[in-house]
């Protein structure tokens, strides 16, 4: 899709397996033409996406794309769940696909569950 609309490049049904206690950066890649849009993160609670107000965020600029980053320093068990970024552009709200974080409690490295073990534990989201 090549246009001057704002585009948010989060893959549909993307997933991340992360460890509680570690730092993690959740990126929202943003493409825009002229003025950088106002971007926010929210966390899904059922069908409602609750805006994350008091969380550390930052921008990372690259040549053809910018990244609006949500920082987890450190990751906490209740960071489990699905997140979405949204951009305000010319009074339009553009929403990304949601991306899901599967958080596991701290274990020794040899005991860390694999990505597939994480994917098989949907109860971790609740």
């Amino acid at each position: 899709k090549e246009s001057c609309d704002v585009q948010l490049y989060i893959k549909r049904q993307s997933e991340h397996s992360i460890l509680a206690g570690d730092p993690f950066e959740l990126e929202c890649p943003v493409k825009y033409c002229a003025n950088r849009p106002h971007v926010t993160w929210c966390k899904l609670n059922g069908t409602t996406c609750v805006k994350l107000e008091d969380r550390q965020t930052s921008w990372k600029e690259e040549k053809n794309i910018s990244f609006f980053i949500l920082h987890f320093e450190p990751v906490l068990p209740n960071d489990n769940g699905s997140y979405r970024c949204s951009a305000n552009f010319q009074s339009n709200l553009i929403e990304s696909h949601s991306t899901t974080l599967y958080v596991t409690d701290v274990k020794s490295a040899s005991e860390r569950p694999s990505k597939d073990e994480m994917a098989s534990r949907p109860w971790l989201l609740y």
Epitope: K1, Y9, K11, R12, S14, S17, T47, K115, D116
Partner: antibody
Amino acid sequence: QVQLQESGPGLVKPSGTLSLTCAASGVNIKDTYMYWVRQPPGKGLEWIGRIDPANGYTRYNPSFKSRATISADKSKNQASLKLSSVTAADTAVYYCAVYDGYYESFDVWGQGTLVTVSS
Amino acid sequence: DIQMTQSPSSLSASVGDRVTITCRSSQSLLDSDGKSYLNWLQQKPGKAPKRLIYLVSKLDSGVPSRFSGSGSGTDFTLTISSLQPEDFATYYCWQGTLFPRTFGQGTKLEIK
């Protein structure tokens, strides 16, 4: 345009491991999902699993239990499938495919590789 | 797993005919984003499948306009408005809403 090229042995012994590679061109695989589907001779299509090459996160069809492993190498722009403990029932044409992870704007399949499981 | 059921399993038709293939899913394919991830594939003997339609009704690039898709929820349809000789093939529906992805059993379209 997006193209896929599969490679791997066409004959695998029972109880052995089937290994296939799928090289992509015309797209950066980190922007895609890559998946594997198989088709036994004269039968329908069966989804094996997929990978997000950007972070290595995989999803599998539970019917393959723990026998399937899908991996990706971003530097080589390719994905791989390993299927362990194969039997004659695993004889099939194996297809890799790739689709746009953001807008589903393309979905391209490889030419397929017939893998026969026989001693 | 979502079961995908196609009908008919096979179909004989003539060039110029209008043909309809149906696909029913065992549960709704409507995703949380309000879209149904239902695809149609065409497969010719000895060849790889090729996607014709995605998101129920969107035609892939280069697919002739005689192909169309419709439906919602659990019931979907592929229609070929005027069969051409190159359309004789096997057609599969498959869903991309939930894991694992699942396919219909296929509909073989043969020349009458």
